[in-house]
């Protein structure tokens, strides 16, 4: 239970006072205010919004609100030389061109500075050649093409449908397959829900709608020119040839009307199975090239975007802690959008704004949190999590010593079905306890708790009567805090009932149609889901900043470590002969997990019994909890991914959005049967088991009695 003893404040100022102050109507008003014009990173409009937020946070009562600026590599289309893709005939004449911009939504026809759809950081180029359809361009899709179908993508332009995995992974896979260009498109199978009208009459993607997005493979580096260090005034910048994560081939996104024109003429091989077919009226032939009558026609890309070092601005607000001002609980979400940002990010930014307002109201009445709360409005998230990463790089020494927790606050909704939470196991009990105290906004669950509706609609696959909580992956601003610095992190939002479509996003994601009206008309007219998300995010921050003992349960880490060890062992056991031949043993890992479990259990017992009135002991126990996440950090990082340093979790090497457990071992085992030197490959597996076992054991020891 949360307690206010140490903060010397009136009983009125408890969690309930904070939660009661949050209002749906305010979130609605803030969302409207944040979505009337585009706020693309690096633009004057986004700088003005940063200054507005700074001013309002000060008015709300924060102790200080500063802008933190960095000069980072961004990418923009050429205003006078638009990007497009053509079908050309044998004479080189363009017989079809993809659209130059999206048809604007009603009411926004005269808005200027709507950036046309583009793939941020695509190099310039005008490749032409035959088309190959590569499904989602996942690792397994290229395996199917190259190994089973014997189709060579070398020198071809590949067309891939969005969805399932992060677009940057698609581009990386295409590059490795030898493609000379990539076309990304949204298939109605993934971005058009049956029975729903397209925008502006519903929340589905129209044929002219296009998903923007960056196509970097940064692996946590931040600004591509200053990996590991802040992009400040005296930064040393790499040359563009040495920049981290930039794609080497032109890439461009299109909508399904344009995709129809490219795909309807495809010839070559038939799709290998039904999982390669979308919902367009086309054969989904793989190619290469066009069929019969059209075999002399080619596809040509015209990409003229430029990479530019541009100033970005984070807004950092501080609410100083009364008792432990040197312990930081951070609530952060981004401000920059591709266009209007109706959902991404402003549905999150509006919630953060209301949380700040509520905390400010309490502060004006004389209350302070026990620990310091930092609020952040990050810039350039859409360009590779740049604002948050640069700030964390600049403040890494403070953060690694003082960072208690990071709560992310991007889009508050991606649907209106149920809650979705991804977090460190340390926060499981916090989330469970909090959601039991909150009212469910769901129809049919009036008078019931959020925990109850969430558990009913999204049950845990392992534990009955509990809700699903997922692993943290990446693709958002928690990345640097969790994966690089080892600060306990979590995120929460309302989601859809599309478990199969987990990583495709909502239909209008990153399109011009992501407007205020989309949210107000179709997703959350009463803003009740936004309010619930504000209560969850704000409630987590409140508890993390105010509870005397940190609301972390290390026993939950023990449980998942065992689960992850079992999982990785079973993957390895698909190769029993090799494990025997190369003497591969997981004994050290299972032993370490057993030790962790026992030590965590004893620590939890001590946590119940220690004298909480002794500030030294209290601080000691809290520090052990705070530093537990940090203990899973390997300073050397993962192989070829130095900024992914968490040994238990990393973004999947095949999908940045997804989290992978024991990623070092997982990657060493992946496709091991195809490795040219099995002895070396299995040696790396053994090394990764050693690193994982050591790290788990070392983390366990941080929970042992100190002397």
């Amino acid at each position: 239970k949360s307690s206010n003893e140490a903060t010397n404040i009136t009983p009125k100022h408890n969690m309930k006072a904070f939660l009661d102050e949050l209002k749906a109507e305010n979130i609605k008003k803030f969302l409207y205010n944040f979505t009337q014009i585009p706020h693309l990173a690096g633009t004057e409009q986004n700088f003005q919004l940063a200054k507005q937020i700074q001013s309002q946070w000060k008015e709300f009562g924060l102790d200080s609100v500063e802008l933190a600026h960095y000069d980072v590599l961004l990418s923009y289309p050429n205003k006078t030389h638009p990007n497009y893709i053509s079908i050309i005939n044998e004479d080189g004449n363009e017989i079809f061109n993809t659209s130059l911009f999206e048809p604007p939504p009603p009411g926004y026809e005269n808005v200027s500075d709507i950036v046309p759809p583009f793939s941020a950081f695509s190099p310039q180029g005008m490749p032409e050649g035959d088309l190959v359809y590569v499904n989602y361009a996942r690792t397994e899709d290229f395996f199917k093409l190259e190994r089973d179908m014997k189709i060579n993508c070398s020198g071809k332009i590949v067309i891939a449908r969005y969805g399932k995995v992060f677009r940057g992974n698609k581009v990386k896979n295409a590059q490795l397959a030898g493609a000379k260009g990539v076309i990304l498109y949204s298939d109605p199978a993934d971005y058009f829900a049956p029975g729903v009208k397209s925008y502006p009459d519903g929340w589905n993607l129209p044929g002219g709608g296009v998903q923007r997005g960056n196509i970097l493979n940064l692996n946590g580096a931040g600004d591509p020119l200053t990996p590991g260090y802040p992009a400040n005034e005296y930064a040393y910048r790499r040359g563009i040839a040495e920049a981290v994560g930039l794609p080497s081939i032109p890439v461009h996104p299109i909508g399904y009307y344009d995709a129809q024109k490219l795909l309807e003429k495809m010839g070559g091989s038939a799709p290998p199975d039904s999982s390669w077919r979308g919902s367009l009226k086309v054969p989904y032939n793989v190619g290469p090239g066009f069929t019969g009558n059209f075999s002399t026609q080619k596809v040509k890309m015209h990409i003229h975007s430029t990479n530019e070092v541009t100033r970005i601005y984070n807004v950092i607000g501080t609410l100083r802690g009364a008792v432990e001002p040197d312990r930081y609980v951070i609530l952060g979400g981004h401000r920059d959008s591709w266009v209007f940002g109706g959902i991404d990010p402003q549905s999150g930014a509006a919630v953060v704004h209301e949380i700040v307002r509520s905390f400010g109201t309490l502060k004006k009445e004389g209350w302070r949190p026990r620990r310091t709360i930092l609020f952040a409005s990050w810039d350039a998230e859409e360009f590779g999590l740049l604002g948050s990463t640069e700030w964390a790089e600049e403040n890494s020494r403070l953060l690694q010593e003082r960072g208690v927790a990071y709560i992310n606050a991007d889009s508050s909704i991606e649907g209106n079905y149920t809650l979705r939470v991804d977090c460190t196991p340390l926060m499981y009990s916090l989330v469970h306890n909090l959601t039991k105290e909150l009212k469910s906004p769901d129809e049919g669950f009036e008078g019931k708790s959020l925990y109850e509706s969430w558990t009913k609609k999204s049950p845990s696959p392992e534990f009955s009567g509990m809700p699903r909580i997922s692993k943290l992956g990446s693709g958002n601003d928690f990345e640097v805090f969790f994966q690089r610095l080892g600060i306990a992190s979590g995120r929460a939002r309302y989601t859809k009932n599309w478990e199969t479509n987990k990583f495709s996003g909502y239909p209008l994601y990153h399109s011009v149609y992501e407007t205020y009206e989309l949210v107000e008309k179709f997703y959350d007219p009463m803003f009740k889901y936004h309010l619930t998300v504000a209560q969850v995010r704000g409630g987590m921050v409140f508890e993390l900043a105010n509870s005397i003992v940190l609301p972390f349960d290390c026993r939950d880490y023990a449980v998942v470590l065992r689960k992850y060890a079992d999982k990785i062992y079973s993957i390895s056991m698909k190769h029993p002969q090799e494990m025997k031949t190369y003497s591969v043993s997981f004994d050290s890992l299972f032993s370490a997990v057993k030790n962790f479990t026992e030590i965590a259990s004893k620590f939890s017992e001590r946590l119940q019994d220690f004298d909480k009135s002794n500030p030294i002991v209290l601080r000691m126990m809290n520090d052990q909890l705070m530093f537990l996440e940090r203990a899973f950090i390997d300073p050397l990082g993962l192989p070829d991914r130095p900024f992914y340093r968490h040994v238990i979790y990393a973004p999947s090497s095949h999908n940045k959005y997804a989290g992978e457990s024991f990623p070092g071992i997982y990657d060493a085992l992946f496709d091991i049967e195809s490795k040219v030197d099995p002895s070396k490959a299995w040696g790396e597996v053994k090394r990764q088991i050693y690193v994982a076992a050591f790290t788990v054991q070392a983390a366990a020891e941080t929970l042992s009695e100190v002397a």
Partner: antibody
Amino acid sequence: EVQLVESGGGVVQPGRSLRLSCAASGFTFITYGMHWVRQAPGKGLEWVAVVSFDESNKYYADSVKGRFTISRDNSKNTLYLQMNSLRAEDTAVYYCARALRDGNNWDYFNGMDVWGQGTTVTVSS
Amino acid sequence: QSVLTQPPSVSGAPGQRVTISCTGSSSNIGADYDVHWYQHLPGTAPKLLIYGNSNRPSGVPDRFSGSKSGTSASLAITGLQAEDETDYYCQSYDSSLSGWVFGGGTKLTVL
């Protein structure tokens, strides 16, 4: 009320030029493809040209290719047909028409759902 | 010579049913491109009657229906009325011409 109003027709000598305009109102012009269609005296309808909403694509009937240019000014909600090197066989009533929204394709690959009343072009010496 | 072939004229008595055919080829109707039908009284704006082979815009009576099969399409009018006497055109897209094509038109006479 959705409306298309053509103007700019008239009598012109062979080899000369003429520019037709079509003013659109009552709908979001910038989001629609637009066509020109003509009807010569005593003949049927003949498609002339089409332009996509963003001018990324323009297509012409073989009979006018290289002589006619379709364009649009989305800020003025106006469609144009610039007709050069006019011939006697270009004599017709010229209609502008809005492309029809339907199916899994750009509207300009579909039919035409809203038509203007037409403007008459006579090419005669 | 139109790419889409229609009969020059058809006729029927009031209350009767008439059909107007529209025959194309493998590069237009047969290539799965939609067929649209228009009613045109000379000197006025043509009116969309049927779109996407068989769909009626709002305001068009259900006496008008369209169908498509293979390389041809047809327009059926039931319960003929005097005001139906005018010209009817079919239209589709032709991939070999990269253009939009009309039939030559059919004059409907209500006897």
